[in-house]
């Protein structure tokens, strides 16, 4: 088992909104849970976009999940990762 590296980035979307993207890379096996939580509960699936789980060329895998949020409300969102029984949560950078 190889645990993922998780990285959260933000980019301007439209006025007053930002897109936050949570990327997991370098993990094996390929089964992974990656999702956004808002206010501590699941963010509805129709407001999240997932990338495919793809090989990254080193025998490991990578994927991502993104969502659009209101600027100034970043604290209310965390990216949740679960892989091979381990988990972590990742805030949106300021």
């Amino acid at each position: 088992t190889v645990p993922p590296m998780v990285n959260v980035t933000r980019s301007e979307a439209s006025e007053g909104n930002i897109t936050v993207t949570c990327r997991a890379s370098g993990f094996y096996p390929w089964n992974i849970t990656l999702s956004w939580r808002q206010d501590g509960v699941s963010l509805s699936h129709d407001t999240q976009q997932w990338g495919d789980v793809l090989p990254d060329g080193n025998g490991t895998y990578q994927t991502w999940v993104a969502t659009r949020i209101c600027q100034g409300e970043e604290q209310r969102f965390t990216c949740y990762m679960e892989h091979s029984g381990n988990h972590s949560t990742h805030p949106v950078p300021s």
Epitope: R37, G40, Q75, Y80
Partner: antibody, heavy 119, light 107 residues
Framework: DVQLQESGPGLVKPSQSLSLTCTVT?????????WNWIRQFPRNKLEWMGY???????NYNPSLKSRISITRDTSKNQFFLQLISVTTEDTATYYC????????????WGQGTLVTVSA | DIQMTQSPASLSASVGETVTITCRAS??????LAWYQQKQGKSPQLLVY???MLADGVPSRFSASGSGTQYSLKINSLQPEDFGSYYC?????????FGAGTKVEIK
């Protein structure tokens, strides 16, 4: 460590309002987190009532939405529960608690305060 | 709303025994589950979060598992301090709801 302490009257008459205070020490309620009220009925059933978060946004249990209000006094680091038009069914031990945004579980609770609704 | 159904409602066990408590959600909660222990006259205390993760300071005789709608809490080699009530709580969506509890009593 975050510490929470509930206070308020132990006896309320039916049709009146129930008002409770949660005093938080060890952490500013405006820094982060969701600050919650949870109650436990005499037969031990637990009910999440609602929260006010670090920015003042509230979220209530729909079963209480027409009767509940959660507010705060940031200068005193306190948040409050008001429940209007109470009945004997609102007799319960009322707890304040908080959760972090990595997940809505409750790591620490106040000691609880029993409120009896009776004429 | 997601309803949480706990079983059994109560059980009697001896010190040293292994006990298992189960919690069923009315919909898939995707491991968004916590367990609490409550002793008589005290506040609930967090035992488990994210379905399987032990909270700080929780003894390793406690373990939790599950997925989808079915979850369980297991206590190996029950100790005197483990007697009390146990509650599950989901945090998949609002409103947050709790199970009705399981009372673990001394046989």
């Amino acid at each position: 460590d975050v510490q929470l302490q509930e206070s308020g009257p132990g006896l309320v008459k039916p049709s009146q309002s129930l008002s409770l205070t949660c005093t938080v020490t060890g952490y500013s309620i405006t820094s982060d987190y969701a600050w919650n009220w949870i109650r436990q009925f005499p037969r031990n059933k637990l009910e999440w009532m609602g929260y006010i978060n670090y920015s003042g946004t509230t979220n209530y249990n729909p079963s209480l939405k027409s009767r509940i209000s959660i507010t705060r006094d940031t200068s005193k680091n306190q948040f409050f529960l008001q429940l209007i038009s109470v009945t004997t069914e609102d007799t319960a031990t009322y707890y304040c608690s908080y959760y972090r945004y990595d997940g809505a579980w409750f790591p620490y609770w106040g000691q609880g305060t029993l409120v009896t609704v009776s004429a | 709303d997601i309803q949480m159904t706990q079983s059994p409602a109560s059980l009697s066990a001896s010190v040293g025994e292994t006990v298992t408590i189960t919690c069923r959600a009315s919909g898939n909660i995707h491991n968004y589950l916590a367990w609490y222990q409550q002793k008589q006259g005290k506040s609930p205390q967090l035992l488990v979060y994210n379905a399987i993760m032990l909270a700080d300071g929780v003894p390793s005789r406690f373990s939790a598992s599950g997925s989808g709608t079915q979850y369980s809490l297991k206590i190996n080699s029950l100790q005197p301090e483990d007697f009390g009530s146990y509650y599950c709580q989901h945090f998949w969506s609002f409103p947050l709801t709790f199970g009705a509890g399981t009372k673990v009593e001394i046989k």
